[in-house]
Interface confidence: low
């Protein structure tokens, strides 16, 4: 921003203080710095006599030798004394420039804050997409490959990276499967992506009684209630954020099943034999 000229010392050069002002268009005059300044204190001593003019009709300035110009070499020996109330010390545009500059700065910082302020990344567990089942008759073991669907929404005005997805499946408070996906995708500003991930699960050992249930032909839909847990790790500007979801889902362990998204939450558990 510009400096206020009224704050400059009396011995500032005209280049520093008031560019391009000559005695010709000055309403006041070039003065000997011996004159009393406004607060009544003496200024510095100078070799030049006091001269006064009042404008275009004033007497020719003796120090300018009638030329209306300061002789070469004297630029640094003369000072201009201007009343504090002189309008030229308060150019009308300075306030405007200052306010405009402040406004632009505020606007830019506001925009920066608005666009760069971290917003939430929403993770919505949609449900089980498919469940593929196989059995080991000898070991009385069930193998279930469960594919789940997630919707991840980026509410930011910049891209975020889905760094990894960790998932686990629980049955009857026992973890029966885990999965981890790395470097999955980048989600653009204000964009949403649907991500499928598969968790291989094994129901065996102390839960081998489930083998009977899952292979029981008297039941058409062998639904078991599984707890799906998923944690999504996203990064932006080097900052990491984790979002977790938990949901109970029905999965049919008696056959390969493809679900309408969200359907596995509301399936009938037991159906009579026709």
């Amino acid at each position: 921003m510009g400096k206020s000229l009224s704050h400059l010392p009396l011995h500032s050069s005209k280049e520093d203080a008031y560019d391009g002002v000559t005695s010709e268009n000055m309403r006041n005059g070039l003065v000997n710095s011996e004159v009393h300044n406004e607060d009544g204190r003496n200024g510095d001593v100078s070799q030049f006599p006091y001269v006064e003019f009042t404008g275009r009709d004033s007497v020719t300035c003796p120090t300018c030798q009638g030329t209306g110009r300061i002789p070469r070499g004297q630029e640094n020996q003369l000072v201009a004394l201007i009343p504090y109330s002189d309008q030229r010390l308060r150019p009308r545009r300075t306030k405007l420039y200052v306010m405009a500059s402040v406004f632009v700065c505020l606007l830019l910082s506001g925009l920066a804050v608005f666009f760069l302020f971290p917003r939430s990344i929403d993770v919505k567990y949609i449900g089980v997409k498919s469940a593929y089942v196989s059995y080991d008759v000898q070991k009385r073991t069930i193998y279930l490959n469960i594919t789940n669907t997630l919707n991840i929404t980026n509410n930011n005005y910049y891209s975020v990276e889905v760094e990894n997805i960790t998932a686990q499946v629980q049955f009857s408070k026992t973890v029966i499967g885990k999965a981890r996906l790395n470097n999955i995708t980048i989600i653009g500003p204000l964009d949403m992506k649907q991500i499928d991930y598969t968790v291989p699960t094994v129901i065996a050992e102390e839960m081998s009684y489930m083998y009977d249930f899952c292979t029981l032909i008297s039941i058409k839909v062998h639904n078991i209630v599984l707890m799906m847990q998923v944690t999504v790790t996203t990064t932006y500007f080097g900052h990491s954020e984790q979002i977790s979801q938990e949901r109970y889902q029905y999965v049919d362990c008696g056959r390969n099943t493809t679900y309408q998204l969200g359907q596995s939450e509301y399936l009938n558990v037991l159906q009579p034999q026709q």
């Epitope: 249930f213 292979t215 032909i217």
Partner: antibody, heavy 118, light 113 residues
Framework: EVQLQQSGPVLVKPGPPVKISCKAS????????IHWVKLSHGKSLEWIGL????????DYNQKFKGKATLTVDTSSSTAYMELNSLTSEDSAVYYC???????????WGQGTTVTVSS | DIVMTQSPSSLSVSAGEKVTMSCKSS????????????LAWYQQKPGQPPKLLIY???TRESGVPDRFTGSGSGTDFTLTISNVQAEDLAVYYC?????????FGAGTKLELK
């Protein structure tokens, strides 16, 4: 300790319905199926149907469809069976029992005697 | 519906004897998927609810004494009680665990001579 506590004996006139209860304790109610079984005097056990407290799903023996209505109240871990259009044929001991992902009930209630008499 | 037929309808035994009772089903109770037979045996004493003894045709429920043995496959099943005790006097039911509706046999009543 696993318990299925059934409501006390009832003596009713033919016609109006009767509702008997089975309060579960000692296990997670919503993890199990609740079955209802009828034991008539001089007859064998008859399976009425089952209800799954997790979501209220039911499955009935065709013979008892329209006769019995099975419901649950998960907040109180209680299963209910309502018998309607009562006749003397409905006089029996009614049992509730639980199963966990199998069809063989392992715990049974003490039974509720329903006597239909004019 | 699967019809369960039990025989005999009653048995008179002395304490310490070995007893065998039979249960036949109108359809096979064998699950070809896992090669298990879905048949259960229950014991019911007067004034008490039924008690699960055997499931899967031959698996003893926890807490059931090993003198109770289940056997058989397909449509023919047997419950054997070796060394009968006084507390074993009850009605024994077999149950189709294979298909809905679940069905029970008429029962075999075990009595003391």
């Amino acid at each position: 300790e696993v318990q299925l506590q059934q409501s006390g004996p009832v003596l009713v006139k033919p016609g109006p319905p009767v509702k008997i209860s089975c309060k579960a304790s000692g296990f997670t109610f919503t993890d199990y199926y609740i079955h209802w079984v009828k034991l008539s005097h001089g007859k064998s056990l008859e399976w009425i149907g089952l209800v799954y407290p997790y979501n209220g799903d039911t499955d009935y023996n065709q013979k008892f469809k329209g006769k019995a209505t099975l419901t649950v109240d998960t907040s109180s871990s209680t299963a209910y069976m309502e018998l309607n259009s009562l006749t003397s044929e409905d006089s029996a001991v009614y049992y509730c029992a639980r199963t966990y992902y199998a069809n063989s009930p392992d715990y049974w209630g003490q039974g509720t005697t329903v006597t239909v008499s004019s | 519906d699967i019809v369960m037929t039990q025989s005999p309808s009653s048995l008179s035994v002395s304490a310490g004897e070995k007893v065998t009772m039979s249960c036949k089903s109108s359809q096979s109770l064998l699950n070809s998927g896992n090669q298990r037979n879905y048949l259960a045996w229950y014991q019911q004493k007067p004034g008490q609810p039924p008690k699960l003894l055997i499931y899967g045709a031959s698996t003893r429920e926890s807490g059931v004494p090993d003198r109770f043995t289940g056997s058989g496959s397909g449509t023919d099943f047997t419950l054997t009680i070796s060394n009968v005790q006084a507390e074993d006097l009850a009605v024994y039911y077999c149950q189709n665990d294979h298909s809905y509706p679940l069905t029970f046999g008429a029962g075999t009543k075990l009595e003391l001579k």
